[in-house]
Every structure is written in structure tokens, then in C-alpha cells.
Interface confidence: low
């Protein structure tokens, strides 16, 4: 199709080489035509529409995105050629930064219903360049946290080194919807609620003698609880003794709840005490079994191929730790009465004897 009639917008993505960040293009279709696709006017930043199309409306029009090669080749379908670019309704999400994203991106309705729709398209000329590290040491992150129940702010990364007085007018979007309440380089939140989380986009205009560009940055905001003031608690095992059958395999599970920490370095390990000795056991990796905003439950198992007489004299200890402190839970094995036959007992004693020899050769100071 002929793209000469498309409205044009120039955007600049100055990405930080220090952090991962995403970028978003909106399909801002204009409204000179009487088309049900193009019912969004080019809003000035002071205007707020009653309804922004392509966000939550049920009759989402299908939009097709293309990339225009610089060498004049035919338009390329984004979905086929660029796996790191995701088409999500009327937005285009770039998952990884890089100058190779520089180019012209065109969006238009998939279904052309009338002759007017042919020119119903937007061409976005995107320039991508790395931000010089020297420009600002304390620039805002592209991932920002807000503490639930407290006051917070969301800063526009590309403007966070400028004072509010110096800052140009900024247009903010949240999850693709225009936010009209602020024109500043940061959004101040009086009290943080869950719904403040989302994908925020901040735009401002940068002009030189030749042309003007929209400088855009994307911020992923999550709402979090404060760091826990508690050490982890062990949910399982609850009992300090466990009935077992000699000669049979055994798995003991340790489950512990760790409160939320922004910097989360949980420790969970099993060790064995035998008289005056104790040593850490090599066990399968710990795994997270439930993750909530408030806490995380982590599980780690110790596996015994066969329970021996020696195991009955040992103490199995689950040790868990976070930045606040540690907790332990000890388990003593107790033989189930009347469980195994004579063969089981002889087998267990044979294993016990072999293990004693091996054990004593490694631990000379064992009593």
C-alpha cells in the first residue's frame, strides 16, 4: 500500500547500556476520515479524550505493523521478521534495546473497509542510540518500586537528572492510556495502591533547527510491601520425630516461608548431626512453591535411599536464613514398630556395617 499519506511521528529511544529496558510504540491513528478505525484525534497534551481506542474496548480493531527497510525494499511484516518485537493490540513492544531497532515502523488497520481507510496509517521514524554513561550518574531506573501505603514517585528516566524547573512538559501514559494529571518529569503518588503498578511511558519533545523529536522512555512500576522484619519460619516438618521403616527410602521435606525482601537471598540447607559431628548434605535444589506479594514459600528435600540403624541415631536439621536471621528445625527418626520382616533388618544391618567402615575411614576422630 502507499505509505505517502501516512501521518508521521519521529521518536528517539536513548537506551541505557547499564540496564535492561523495553520500548513501546503506540498506533496513534489520526481522524481526518470518517472511519471507525480512525476515530482518535491527534490529541494535544492538554486534551483528554473520553475514550482512547485500542485499550480496553471490546471491538478492538486489528492493526497490522510493518517495518520499512532503509534500502527501499518492500515493507516487512513485524511478526515474521522480528521475534524480539511483540505486537500487543495497538502497541508494539521492543523487548531488547539496540541500535538495530532504528527504522521506520508503520501501522494501519488490518481490515480496509472503505477508500478512506487506505490513508489511515501512522509512520513512526524511530532512532535508537545508547545513552552516554557520563550524562547522569543517578538517572532513574526503568524498573521502579513503590511502597504500598506510603508516598512515592515515578520518575521519567530520560529527564531524571534535570530539576523540575528545567524540565520540559512531559506526557505520561499508563498501560497505554493518557494520564492527564501531570505534565512534570515525575508523577507523585500520595498513597500507593496496588493499581499504581503497570507500564508507564513518558514523552517529551526535543527540537533542533531541522526538526523535532519525541523522546520516549518506558518505566515498569511494581508496588511492593516493605521488607520483612522477621526471620523465615519453617512450616514443615512440624514434628521433631518421624516414624520410618528400616531399609526403605525416605524423603524429608523442609518448607519455609520467607517474608518479602527487595534484595532476596534466601538460604535453605539440610545438615546432619551425629554425636559431635555435623555436616551439610548435598540435596536437590530448593524450589519456590508459592510466591505472593507478602512472602515466598520455598521447599527443599533430603532424600535417603535406604534408612539405616545409624540414621536412627542421627539428627536431620533444616536450616533457613534471610537477612534478618535464621531458623532451624530438627528431625529425629524413630523406627516404626512391627513394620519390616527379618530380611529388612538383616539388609539394614548389612548397609549399616558397610557405612560404618566407610564413615570411620573418613572421620578418624569419630567416637
Amino acid at each position: 500500500f502507499n505509505i505517502s499519506g501516512c501521518s508521521t511521528k519521529k521518536l528517539l529511544w536513548a537506551y541505557s547500556t547499564r540496564s535492561e529496558e523495553e520500548f513501546i510504540l503506540f498506533c496513534d491513528l489520526p481522524e481526518p476520515q470518517k472511519s471507525h478505525f480512525c476515530h482518535r484525534s491527534q490529541l494535544s497534551p492538554t486534551q483528554v479524550p473520553d475514550h482512547l481506542p485500542f485499550t480496553d474496548s471490546k471491538d478492538l480493531p486489528d492493526v497490522q505493523w510493518y517495518r520499512q527497510p532503509s534500502n527501499g525494499d518492500p515493507l516487512e511484516d513485524i511478526r515474521k521478521s522480528y521475534p524480539h518485537i511483540i505486537q500487543d493490540k495497538c502497541t508494539l513492544r521492543f523487548l531488547t534495546p539496540g541500535v538495530n531497532n532504528t527504522g521506520s515502523y508503520i501501522c494501519r488497520p488490518k481490515m480496509i473497509k472503505s477508500p478512506y481507510d487506505v490513508a489511515c496509517c501512522v509512520k513512526m521514524i524511530l532512532e535508537v542510540k545508547p545513552q552516554s554513561n557520563a550524562s547522569c550518574e543517578n538517572s532513574a531506573s526503568h524498573k521502579q518500586d513503590l511502597l504500598l501505603g506510603s508516598t512515592g514517585s515515578i520518575s521519567c528516566p530520560s529527564l531524571s537528572c534535570q530539576s523540575d524547573a528545567q524540565s520540559p512538559e512531559v506526557t505520561w501514559y499508563k498501560n497505554g492510556k493518557l494520564l492527564s494529571m501531570t505534565r512534570s518529569n515525575r508523577i507523585v503518588v500520595d498513597e500507593v495502591y496496588i493499581y499504581h503498578q503497570g507500564t508507564y511511558v513518558c514523552d517529551y519533545t526535543q527540537s533542533d533547527t531541522a526538526s523535532s523529536w519525541t523522546v520516549r522512555a518506558v518505566v515498569q512500576v511494581r508496588t511492593i510491601v516493605g521488607d520483612t522484619k522477621l526471620k523465615p519460619d519453617i512450616l514443615d516438618p512440624v514434628e521433631s520425630t518421624l516414624e520410618v521403616e528400616l531399609g526403605k527410602p525416605l524423603t524429608i521435606s523442609c518448607k519455609a516461608r520467607f517474608g518479602f525482601e527487595r534484595v532476596f537471598n534466601p538460604v535453605m540447607k539440610w545438615y546432619i548431626k551425629d554425636a559431635d559431628l555435623e555436616w551439610e548434605v548435598s540435596v536437590p535444589e530448593a524450589k519456590s512453591i508459592k510466591s505472593t506479594l507478602k512472602d515466598e514459600i520455598i521447599e527443599r528435600n533430603i532424600i535417603l535411599e535406604k534408612v539405616t540403624q545409624r540414621d536412627l541415631r542421627r539428627t536431620f536439621v533444616c536450616f533457613v536464613q534471610n537477612s534478618i536471621g535464621n531458623t532451624t528445625q530438627s528431625v529425629q527418626l524413630k523406627e516404626k514398630r512391627g513394620s519390616g520382616g527379618l530380611n529388612d533388618i538383616f539388609e539394614a544391618q548389612k548397609i549399616e556395617w558397610h557405612e560404618t567402615v566407610r564413615f570411620q575411614s573418613h572421620h578418624h576422630h569419630h567416637h
Epitope: 480496553d56 471490546k58 504500598l148 501505603g149 506510603s150 498513597e191 495502591y193 496496588i194 503498578q197 508496588t223 510491601v225 517474608g259 518479602f260 510466591s291 505472593t292 506479594l293 507478602k294 512472602d295
Partner: antibody, heavy 123, light 107 residues
Framework: QVQLQESGPGLVKPSETLSLTCTVS????????WTWIRQPPGKGLEWIGY???????NYNPSLKSRVTISVDTSKNQFSLKLSSVTAADTAVYYC?????????????????WGQGTTVTVSS | AIQLTQSPSSLSASVGDRVTITCRAS??????LAWYQQKPGKAPKLLIY???NWESGVPSRFSGSGSGTDFTLTISSLQPEDFATYYC?????????FGQGTKVEIK
Amino acid sequence: QVQLQESGPGLVKPSETLSLTCTVSGGSISNYYWTWIRQPPGKGLEWIGYISDSGSTNYNPSLKSRVTISVDTSKNQFSLKLSSVTAADTAVYYCARETIVVRGFYFYVMDVWGQGTTVTVSS
Amino acid sequence: AIQLTQSPSSLSASVGDRVTITCRASQGISSALAWYQQKPGKAPKLLIYEASNWESGVPSRFSGSGSGTDFTLTISSLQPEDFATYYCQQFNSYPWTFGQGTKVEIK
């Protein structure tokens, strides 16, 4: 194991204020949202509102002008006050804990409920 | 407020039957939907959250599916203890709202 227990008068006169308390045992009131829900006899469930451990609230617009939810973290309790009651406020009132589960986005679950307390509005 | 409409309002089934309850939202709610079971004189009990995730301890015969506006709760093989009223609830936007309930009775 966290348990919730509602308490308060079972009979309230029309135009008076209904007051209920929910006591949280077996766990802390911190780090959760605490909710009130009601169920008129033979009818469905209606969300009244919530309070966070820090005291921030959100109420159902249909009841907002009459509802106050408060929290007392030192006693591990939160309370509901509903003013200017009428016979239409006769219901079983439940308190519940709201947890937020994270899976990329946040999803809310009311995972622990009190057993409910019946409140009748009658003169 | 978002309205949730459950269907059917009631149904009669036998032990071992496969039962399906639907919940339709008046607008898209992504997957922010929970299902509860309520027995007479008892508080509701959470079965499914985020449209399809089991709450811990809930039998695997209960399953949830759907996204956007249409959701389903399925009981693959009805057990005697499953006779109860089932409610859906949306957590997409305030105020939280519930469906009117579906009563599952013994045939």
C-alpha cells in the same frame, strides 16, 4: 493457621449504627488487606470494603456514605461500622483476609474467611 | 461496577456427573476471577483464583478456565460433598463484585 472471628450485636434498631469487630488469631494483621462482605438471607454476596494494615481503605460506592472500616494492629483486630441501618442491611456479615498473589501481575484472593455473624435490623 | 452473570442459577446432578458452571462479565476482566464454594450456614471457601489456579488443598476435580468476559468452573466427577452453591468473583476493578450464585443440587 490464621483464623478470623466476627463479633458484635446480633440485633440492631433501624437508623442506628451497626458495629462489628473481626479478631485475627494465629497470624499477624500486618502485610494483608482485610475485607468485609455481607450476604442477605437467601441472597448472594456483596463486597463492603477493605482496609490495609496501614489503614488505607476502599469502600463499595453503594455503601460508601455509611461505611467506616478501621484497624487496630495492636489488638490484631479490624472493625466495621455501618450507620443509618434499615431492614435491607439484615445479613450475615463475613470478614475475610485478602492476599495478593504475584504471577507477573497481581491477583487478589480472599483465602481466609470468618464463619460469619448474623445481624438483624429490627425495632 | 462490573456485573457477573452466572448460569445456570441452579442445576440438579448425580454423583459422578461432570458439571459446568459459567460466569460472564459485563466487560473484560483479563483473568482476574475467583471461584468460591459455599455450603449452607458456612462461609464461602476459595476454590480457584486467577481464573484457573487451584487454591492449595482443593481437589483436582475442580478446574477453572476462561479469560476476558467468559469463564467456566468444571467439576469433572461430582462427589457427595460438592453439593453446594458456587460463586464467581471479579478482582479486576473496584468494587469487587460476585455472581448471583449457582446452586448444585442432588438429582
